[in-house]
């Protein structure tokens, strides 16, 4: 999955009069990240995590930039001709992505009363619109307004593409990646194998993404590959994964063995439980 930054900017009109407020919701890698109105931006969650993202900076720049965008969108809404009585909304959704091969994509989408009527690929500058006559009318309306000052518009949308990517890179550089990662629950069990030996099994479950390192160590040193048996990494039905690794050891030497787990940059070690044998079964065929 690419890293992404998604801005959802909403302005409102009531009985044809454009309201002064606006709301921007920002998602980083698909997770709620920042919510801004015309007065301030607020991170989600606040606290230690937000401090990690920002360092010693504040959200002042974001607030200033998004306030400017809010004004632009209010002007756009004011130029939509078919405003009827009651409440109406204009949304601009802007998305930029950085893919694993470092290629980038940016797009912009306009919605009126929740209905998509105009999209632009911000790299190719290509516009697309749905086939409905209402969407076509709205799209022509907005495009004509945006073309009124063609140079400003061109500069504005180039800047939007560049700024979005620059912001995304800045947030990612902070080391706070919101891409979904769920650490595993790790559970070690022991079972009787044969006289004087026990099989110890280390199970990791509920983790995402699927890449994981799970292995047995003796006195802190990894056991050779052929003395361990691995289960496949399998989906568990909850959008996460599970796997296991087992090895056979001499009874009485349990305290020398630990299960080592590494996942998404985090690692942990898990001892063999002491005491009676818990499960009377063998993983070895």
């Amino acid at each position: 999955e690419p890293h992404s930054l998604r801005y959802n900017l909403t302005v409102l009109s009531w009985d044809g009069s454009v309201q002064s407020g606006f709301l921007t919701e920002v998602h980083l890698d698909g997770q709620p990240f920042l919510r801004c109105d015309r007065q301030k931006c607020r991170a989600k969650p606040q606290g230690q995590w937000a401090e990690d993202v920002l360092g010693n900076k504040t959200w002042d720049r974001e607030t200033r930039d998004l306030t400017g965008n809010g004004k632009d969108l209010r002007m756009t809404l004011a130029h939509i001709k078919d405003q009827k009585e009651g409440l109406h909304s204009l949304q601009e959704i802007r998305v930029c992505e950085i893919h694993e091969d470092n290629s980038t994509r940016s797009s912009q989408h306009f919605y009126y009363d929740g209905e998509l009527f105009l999209s632009q690929n911000l790299e190719t500058k290509e516009w697309t619109m749905p086939q409905s006559s209402r969407a076509q009318t709205l799209a022509m309306n907005v495009r004509n307004f945006l073309k009124e000052d063609a140079m400003k518009t061109k500069t504005h949308y180039h800047a939007m593409h560049a700024d979005c990517l620059q912001e995304l890179r800045r947030y990612l550089k902070s080391g706070v990646v919101l891409r979904r990662t769920v650490p595993p629950m790790v559970n070690v069990t022991r079972s009787e194998a044969s006289e004087g030996n026990i099989t110890v099994t280390c199970r990791a479950s509920g983790f995402y993404p699927w890449n994981i390192t799970l292995s047995w160590r003796q006195d802190g040193v990894s056991l050779s590959h052929d003395t361990q048996q691995w289960g496949d990494v399998l989906p568990d039905g909850n959008g996460t994964y599970q796997t296991w690794v087992a090895t056979r050891i001499c009874q009485g030497e349990e305290q020398r063995f630990t299960c080592y787990m590494e996942h998404s940059g985090n690692h942990s070690t898990h001892p063999v439980p002491s005491g009676k044998v818990l499960v009377l079964q063998s993983h070895w065929q």
Partner: antibody, heavy 124, light 107 residues
Framework: QVQLQQSGPGLVKPSQTLSLTCAIS??????????WNWIRQSPSRGLEWLGR?????????DYAVSVKSRITINPDTSTNQFSLQLNSVTPDDTAVYYC??????????????WGQGTMVTVSS | DIQLTQSPSSLSASVGDRVTITCQAS??????LNWYQQKPGKAPKLLIY???NLETGVPPRFSGSGSGTAFTFTISSLQPEDFATYYC?????????FGPGTKVDIK
């Protein structure tokens, strides 16, 4: 559905450590859209937020300044629970302690699921 | 810390009455406010989030409004099960803070 089950002693001696555990079912302590909180309630202080733990690519904690020097909230992914430790307690820490989840709503930091509460008395 | 004050601190009402509680914040908190109901010996229960959004499963007789520093919580027609204490809570800034509560009892 999501449930929180609290456990821990109801009586703690002054200067000792208050320890409570909150077991989660129906959700994961390492969900990266939730935060796991401790809140207490007493007649003198009302409802008082103490702190939280949450996972966003790594583990974070936020604590109320009033208890920051004495509090630790730890997640335990192997048992899917989280714990509260409050050191050097005084009778002023006598309260009903609640664990609570925050995170069902995309933007609102609302405590939508609560534990049953544990009355903790600090007395010798 | 952001202070929240509630008024009244208690009120007596009858079944069917319209009940209004206000919550005042010590600074602008936009719409970052929730309302809870608590019955004796029980944990608080979320009723309203983001100042005006009804939590799933909560009856529509409960409503909330306001933004900035002034907020209102309303029960349009009080039912026997609504006699309880109601709290507002802000999440604009850490630490999360709660109002002192408003106790609604039977007249």
């Amino acid at each position: 559905q999501v449930q929180l089950q609290q456990s821990g002693p109801g009586l703690v001696k002054p200067s000792q450590t208050l320890s409570l555990t909150c077991a989660i079912s129906g959700d994961s302590v390492s969900s990266n859209s939730a935060a796991w909180n401790w809140i207490r309630q007493s007649p003198s202080r009302g409802l008082e937020w103490l702190g939280r733990t949450y996972y966003r690519s790594k583990w974070y904690n936020d604590y109320a300044v009033s208890v920051k020097s004495r509090i630790t909230i730890n997640p335990d992914t192997s048992t899917n629970q989280f714990s509260l430790q409050l050191n050097s307690v005084t009778p002023d820490d006598t309260a009903v302690y609640y664990c609570a989840r925050e995170g069902a709503h995309e933007w609102a930091d609302a405590f939508d699921i609560w534990g049953q509460g544990t009355m903790v008395t600090v007395s010798s | 810390d952001i202070q929240l004050t509630q008024s009244p601190s208690s009120l007596s009402a009858s079944v069917g009455d319209r009940v209004t509680i206000t919550c005042q914040a010590s600074q602008d908190i936009s719409n970052y406010l929730n309302w809870y109901q608590q019955k004796p010996g029980k944990a608080p229960k979320l009723l309203i989030y983001d100042a005006s959004n009804l939590e799933t499963g909560v009856p529509p007789r409960f409503s909330g409004s306001g933004s900035g520093t002034a907020f209102t919580f309303t029960i349009s027609s009080l039912q026997p099960e609504d006699f309880a204490t109601y709290y507002c809570q802000q999440y604009d800034n850490l630490p999360h803070t709660f109002g002192p509560g408003t106790k609604v009892d039977i007249k």
